[in-house]
Interface confidence: low
Amino acid sequence: HTAAQDNCTCPTNKMTVCSPDGPGGRCQCRALGSGMAVDCSTLTSKCLLLKARMSAPKNARTLVRPSEHALVDNDGLYDPDCDPEGRFKARQCNQTSVCWCVNSVGVRRTDKGDLSLRCDELVRTHHILIDLRHRPTAGAFNHSDLDAELRRLFRERYRLHPKFVAAVHYEQPTIQIELRQNTSQKAAGDVDIGDAAYYFERDIKGESLFQGRGGLDLRVRGEPLQVERTLIYYLDEIPPKFSMKRLT
């Protein structure tokens, strides 16, 4: 189905306008900001979601990187250019003609330049490390229970194939979820790890993108899992290209 038929809403994206515009009066939903039709049976791409949210502020984040080539989204929110399939265009520019290259999750991977900057291809982010710190609990969570619950969450809520959840690490109070998805592994119809990570990030912040659902109520064996900090690292198939001055 394209969207909920009964009341014509988009279950997977509340940042849409829906009406019975489709063939045979079927409900069709378009993303705010871009006006692009979205498939409400799956997650909307991060690019279209960012475009819809372009006016909302977002805190910048910095921490020590877990690897030499890992990227953190320090630039915050911007109004992205998306291709006709809703993916980020490799080159992004702002209103003042400052341009930069991004990866498949829309995170800057080069120094900023001018309109002459070329970004030959959209480099795929194939490994995402979601680093969470949970609030103090009476005791540590059971690792295997935590692992099972987070895998279930990604499978059922975000429709991410279980094979893309590579690992769940736990050292109280830190939880790390590893998502891995190479270009060759991603089949047509598979949810992108970048989109799943973005939906999860928004859920964790209490800003769910799902229509009409309550916020994320994450429990491990009945015990609430409340996250107090989230940090997401992105690793690309090709290392980013930053000048040395940025690394000092």
Partner: antibody, heavy 121, light 107 residues
Framework: QVQLVQSGAEVKKPGASVKVSCKAS????????MQWVRQAPGQGLEWMGW????????KYAEDFKGRVTISLDTSTSTAYLQLSSLKSEDTAVYYC??????????????WGQGTLVTVSS | DIQMTQSPSSLSASVGDRVTITCKAS??????VAWYQQKPGKAPKLLIY???YRYTGVPSRFSGSGSGTDFTLTISSLQPEDFAVYYC?????????FGQGTKLEIK
Amino acid sequence: QVQLVQSGAEVKKPGASVKVSCKASGYTFTTAGMQWVRQAPGQGLEWMGWINTHSGVPKYAEDFKGRVTISLDTSTSTAYLQLSSLKSEDTAVYYCARSGFGSSYWYFDVWGQGTLVTVSS
Amino acid sequence: DIQMTQSPSSLSASVGDRVTITCKASQDVSTAVAWYQQKPGKAPKLLIYSASYRYTGVPSRFSGSGSGTDFTLTISSLQPEDFAVYYCQQHYITPLTFGQGTKLEIK
């Protein structure tokens, strides 16, 4: 089905103004941009400007700035093009066309039938 | 402004022929080029957008390619209903600009 229906042909004198309407149906008006393009007899297509129906903000081609106004009535899903200080060179078929909001989507997937505006003394 | 130069300006061909129309942008427009077909007295119809994406309902004999400054519309096997004027348009940056058109006539 999705369609754009434009107002009828107009004959105007030089110096006068004309207002062409474009009524949208079959889709949610505020989820797509509305563009205006004109075509002089036997000539090619010329972009005049567009309006973001979500924000109501118009943008005009430099050649028409000061003479053109693009506006909306979202309650009736109608866009308007007003052109003032008409000259004989403004004789053309004026089209409204639907597009997306961002540069990736500034192609025109649905067109109105066109409104012939003739400027003659 | 970005100029879009189409070639040829007119073309004679027969049913069944393979036809190619080219469009050259005066500066890099990435893949933001659309192609339209227009018949006499009618509004243009969208065929291709973003250089290579065929619009809904457009027959598979129409295809588009190119990036940067050079773009091509190909009709693999001409049908009688394909004789019309074809326009390219860049949708990279405003002002949006069109090519001058290519008139495809029956030989």
